[in-house]
């Protein structure tokens, strides 16, 4: 006999990083019928829904209306159809940015590189901060770590065009408290014609759009949506 | 065209500092790294450090670390090295290259720590 | 570190010889190498870089290439002017480092 339901996906919208005194929404999507819908942050209880009519409704949106350090860090999402609650979601690291101070980033050799080159991005800030962080933009965004006083080091290894596109960089004061981002560094890898044609660009996006931090393109399935964002998460951790 | 400007020489005495300076014209200063590269008489040629006069970021040859600094003067197109603490063993020519890719070279400072 | 062991440290060769110069890699650099030509008042001209990419106004006589770590720059025809230092750069991982020089001498 089944003890506990499956797991709902939890994601943020329009994204995981939000820009301070902006608002996001916290979605969950379990199954139909599930007549309540608990949101846990930092391992106690948020917030709570009751959907109507349940049998009609599988996702709940909790809303935060102003984004700030207080309302960053972990929530995760749980879900009951009748007295059978489910397995709790997995974890959603939701991330304020725009504190304090904006990084500046510079990449070796240059912006332009021949595929099979070794670059490194350098990201800078002077204020305190220890934890670096360099995303680029695209579908499939990459997440790098990095640590130092007040500059860190983000070596590529040796690049193809694979690796071409829009770079920033932000300092991150905990886990879950990062900086503006940096002035966007576009890499532009070229290598032969044959290379640059099997090598696709991620999708991009209007610059504008870059205001909500947007690292994915429109959002299709929302499954897909919470899998990605997860796996950008995981990269975080 | 790509010019970088050196000083042809210095004479500084022991335990002094010097400032070496690369004026860079022909380009926009703040697109490209300035590495310096040192090459002692008869000797092969050593990184010291680079810098992106953009961000300020740096990056130094640990060897150089505690002696050498870079910084620029972003409104007159200079790059500057300051060596501190100077011996015999700092006399040198000192170069300053453009580009991650070290694809310009000044002429060199001819440094000479000489009491 | 990356080393970068140069070889040889002279050579003596004719005009309109051909000539390879030789760096190897301690460690992987991609193709982020460059070969630097040296004259004797002490000024620096790049020849090639990222491997083998020639520069503008260096003439087709120069030639870069890589096998695994090892690097190499092919002069297929040497001219007078030529008889002077060269050096490997590598620019993947800093420090960046230099080969130790090629002194190329005139037979």
């Known amino acids: 006999q089944q003890q506990t339901l499956p797991k709902p996906f939890i994601w943020a919208e329009p994204h995981f990083m939000v820009p301070k005194e902006k608002q996001v929404t916290i979605c969950c999507q379990g199954n139909y019928g599930a007549v309540e819908y608990q949101l846990h942050f930092e391992g106690s209880l948020f917030a709570v829904d009751r959907p109507k009519p349940p049998e009609r409704i599988n996702k709940v949106q909790f809303y935060i209306p102003d984004m700030n350090s207080r309302m960053a860090g972990q929530y995760s999402c749980i879900y009951r159809v009748g007295e059978l609650w489910s397995e709790p979601s997995n974890l959603l690291d939701l991330v304020v940015t725009e504190m304090y101070d904006t990084p500046t980033l510079s990449v070796h050799p240059g912006p332009e590189v021949i595929s099979g080159e070794k670059v490194t991005f350098y990201c800078r800030l002077d204020t305190a901060t220890s934890m670096f962080l360099l995303l680029k933009e695209g579908r499939s965004s990459h997440v790098q770590r990095g640590y130092g006083k007040v500059q860190a080091e983000f070596p590529l290894g040796p690049v193809t065009t694979a690796h071409r596109g829009t770079y920033r960089c932000f300092g991150s004061y905990n886990n879950h408290a990062w900086s503006f981002p940096s002035e966007p560094v576009k890499l532009l890898v070229t290598g032969d014609i044959e290379n640059t044609s099997l090598a696709p660009e991620d999708p991009t996006f209007p610059a504008d759009t870059w205001g909500t931090y947007l690292l994915t393109t429109e959002t299709g399935l929302q499954k897909d949506h919470a899998l990605w964002d997860h796996t950008a998460q995981n990269l975080l951790r | 065209q790509v010019q970088l400007q050196q000083p042809g020489a210095e004479l500084v005495k022991p335990g002094a500092s010097v400032k070496l300076s690369c004026k860079a014209s022909g380009y926009t200063f703040t697109s490209y790294w300035m590495n310096w590269v040192k090459q002692r008489p008869g000797q092969g040629l050593e990184w010291i450090g680079m810098?992106?006069?953009?961000?300020?970021?740096?990056n130094y040859n640990e060897k150089f670390k505690s002696q050498a600094t870079l910084t620029v003067d972003k409104s007159s197109s200079t790059a500057y090295m300051q060596l501190s603490s100077l011996t015999s063993e700092d006399s040198a020519v000192y170069y300053c290259?453009?580009?991650?890719?070290?694809?310009?070279w000044g002429q060199g400072t001819t440094l000479t720590v000489s009491s | 570190d990356i080393q970068m062991t140069q070889s040889p440290s002279s050579l003596s060769a004719s005009l309109g010889e051909r000539v390879t110069l030789t760096c190897r890699a301690s460690?992987?650099?991609?193709?982020?190498l460059n070969w630097l030509q040296q004259e004797p008042d002490g000024t620096i001209k790049r020849l090639i870089y990222a491997t083998s990419s020639l520069d503008s106004g260096v003439p087709k006589r120069f030639s870069g290439s890589r096998s695994g770590s090892d690097y190499s720059l092919t002069i297929s025809s040497l001219e007078s002017e030529d008889f002077v230092d060269y050096y490997c750069l590598q620019y993947a991982s800093s420090p960046f480092t230099f080969g130790s020089g090629t002194k190329l001498e005139i037979k």
């Open positions: 460690q992987d650099i991609g193709s982020s």
């Open positions: 290259a453009r580009h991650g890719r070290f694809d310009y």
């Open positions: 810098i992106h006069p953009n961000s300020d970021i740096t």
